[in-house]
Amino acid sequence: PASLAGCYSAPRRAPLWTCLLLCAALRTLLASPSNEVNLLDSRTVMGDLGWIAFPKNGWEEIGEVDENYAPIHTYQVCKVMEQNQNNWLLTSWISNEGASRIFIELKFTLRDCNSLPGGLGTCKETFNMYYFESDDQNGRNIKENQYIKIDTIAADESFTELDLGDRVMKLNTEVRDVGPLSKKGFYLAFQDVGACIALVSVRVYYKKCPSVVRHLAVFPDTITGADSSQLLEVSGSCVNHSVTDEPPKMHCSAEGEWLVPIGKCMCKAGYEEKNGTCQVCRPGFFKASPHIQSCGKCPPHSYTHEEASTSCVCEKDYFRRESDPPTMACTRPPSAPRNAISNVNETSVFLEWIPPADTGGRKDVSYYIACKKCNSHAGVCEECGGHVRYLPRQSGLKNTSVMMVDLLAHTNYTFEIEAVNGVSDLSPGARQYVSVNVTTNQAAPSPVTNVKKGKIAKNSISLSWQEPDRPNGIILEYEIKYFEKDQETSYTIIKSKETTITAEGLKPASVYVFQIRARTAAGYGVFSRRFEFETTPVFAASSDQSQIP
């Protein structure tokens, strides 16, 4: 087979129709789309293209210039009257720049064979395009059969002599793709087999998915895959001041389009998205989490003078619990409960009040009852102690009432009803409470426990005792019941306002049983235990004994 290497064809004077062609071509010089990267564009090459025609009387370059005097590289061939044409045009080496699939866009005109007299037998209306891959930039000394055919190119529109007369050119554009490519570069070849062709421009390009910022993730320029149906998964990187839960990914299609986004970046706490970037929250604004869309104003009673705040600081005397979200207003302890009233029923007290005028901005207000027992004479108060029961409870009361039971009768109490909320324990300020003073009702007194015998004679016994431990009121009098031992049904009762009595008219040398009880306005208490004392014999001296156990 003939070698395709060797001679350059010298430019010759172009026929009129080529000049017309060029005018048409100039009108089609458009910018390439952003997802196409040109490896070769014959329209933009300023100097010699360095292409080879073989044989040298086949394809010829027409040297023309555009309105800016830049050269226009056009190749033409029109050997339609001669048989067995095999004219080749070889490009220079084209780097594929890492692309594994490239596109070839041809702009050309083709003469209609029917419009040519006498050449119907030899005239063709197609030409062939080939490629040969090579790592070598000087590898054009190759054989025809080493080229791989890309396609046979036919014209959608061919022109006639009439078109020439009307100065109308019909420019065809055909695009073919080649891949997968495995070497650093390649050569293209155009084979004419007897057509009348003007090759106006050759543009070789690959497609990329252009670098883009999507969902705050930067995706780099990505060369499309070799396969026309292939989607390349590309990882994005988060823009400044942004973070991600799920690494951002997108898919680059063979057409150079970004598809199927997965994951996204979010502006980190203290930053918000504006115009595809993460901007700092300004003073007075905050963003607590990346998952929040934008910076928000500090909630009530809080502030921040910082940029990039993730929370706001509470004003003086306002607080935030750890469990309070940063979007919640800072709050303060409640004011005191109001209008407390009491209802005493014997040794029980029912307290009722209304909520504080100021809840401190919180809904978790509850109440605590402090109980103090006060000595009315000394004016000293002490904690009530554990014997008092609170219904339903002493602290954490949600309702505005409480009942205290098992109080001491006829005792002065002070109850402090304190309002508390979720930040009361954070505040160093004074407790906020309302006080209620009550005195429990009188009740029957407790038993007399401490009885001492005094002077004992043959016919009388003198006794003294102490007031009951719990008088439960004012002791009005005592009742003393006594009888001769084993004669219980025949007893005598003496009443006394004092804590001493003398029982008269007793039998000498006899044992008597004494029991004492006290009375208040509420009634008698229970009798004390039995105390036994014996009168002296007729001739014995009287005795004065101390306390009987």
Epitope: P283, G284, Y303, H305, E306, K316
Partner: antibody
Framework: EVQLVESGGGLVQPGGSLKLSCAAS????????IHWVRQAPGKGLEWVAS????????YYADSVKGRFTISRDNSKNTLYLQMNSLRAEDTAVYYC?????????????WGQGTLVTVSS | DIVMTQSPDSLAVSLGERATINCKAS??????????MNWYQQKPGKAPKLLIY???NLESGIPDRFSGSGSGTDFTLTISRLEPEDAASYYC?????????FGQGTKLEIK
């Protein structure tokens, strides 16, 4: 009670240096932005510089940029203004003022001021 | 920088009358629906005192005869019934953008 007290003012020659202090009390100093504002004799107020509570954000007026440095020591509740390459036009009463807590913030408390005189 | 221009430079108003001071910013001092405009009062030999923040919010402890209005670039301080102690210089200040610029001041005298 919130108080700001400036000190360190005085007479200095052109090209000289001076360091002003502002002692703060009555509030949580470390959470407040503080500003320096000056007033030349018989003139209006001119904002000079500001610093956030954590010193993360600092701003200067163009007229003092590169010559003045604002700083703070939160452990001492004190704000500073280091003034270098002083010029006659820096003569003024210098006030420190606290950024407020009610949004959008104004300068809610001011010191009594300290006079800086730059003269040969 | 945002330039703040007050008008008038000075004015004299009778006791009990209304006084109005205007302030114009060279560009908007609004952000996110709020106006970053403050008004201060200064008496001779004293430190300035904050009267109004955020264009219309009365600072705590300031009498309610003081009021502020406006948004964007045009703002007004109004004293509804002038009292003797209101004789002072008044300054507007924007806090939307660094540097926080002041107006040149307006001197208010009692007629």
């Amino acid at each position: 009670e919130v108080q700001l007290v400036e000190s360190g003012g005085g007479l200095v020659q052109p090209g000289g240096s001076l360091k002003l202090s502002c002692a703060a009390s009555g509030f949580t100093f470390s959470t407040f932005g503080i500003h320096w504002v000056r007033q030349a004799p018989g003139k209006g107020l001119e904002w000079v510089a500001s610093i956030s509570g954590a010193s993360t954000t600092i701003y200067y007026a163009d007229s003092v940029k590169g010559r003045f440095t604002i700083s703070r020591d939160n452990s001492k509740n004190t704000l500073y203004l280091q003034m270098n390459s002083l010029r006659a036009e820096d003569t003024a009463v210098y006030y420190c003022a606290r950024y407020g807590t009610s949004f959008p913030y104004g300068l809610d408390y001011w010191g009594q001021g300290t006079l800086v005189t730059v003269s040969s | 920088d945002i330039v703040m221009t007050q008008s008038p430079d000075s004015l004299a108003v009778s006791l009990g009358e209304r006084a109005t001071i205007n302030c114009k910013a060279s560009q908007s001092v609004d952000y996110d629906g709020d106006s970053y405009m403050n008004w201060y009062q200064q008496k001779p030999g004293k430190a300035p005192k904050l009267l109004i923040y955020g264009a219309s919010n009365l600072e705590s402890g300031i009498p309610d005869r003081f009021s502020g209005s406006g948004s964007g670039t045009d703002f007004t301080l109004t004293i509804s019934r002038l009292e003797p102690e209101d004789a002072a210089s008044y300054y507007c200040q924007q806090s939307n953008e660094d540097p926080f610029t002041f107006g040149q001041g307006t001197k208010l005298e009692i007629k």
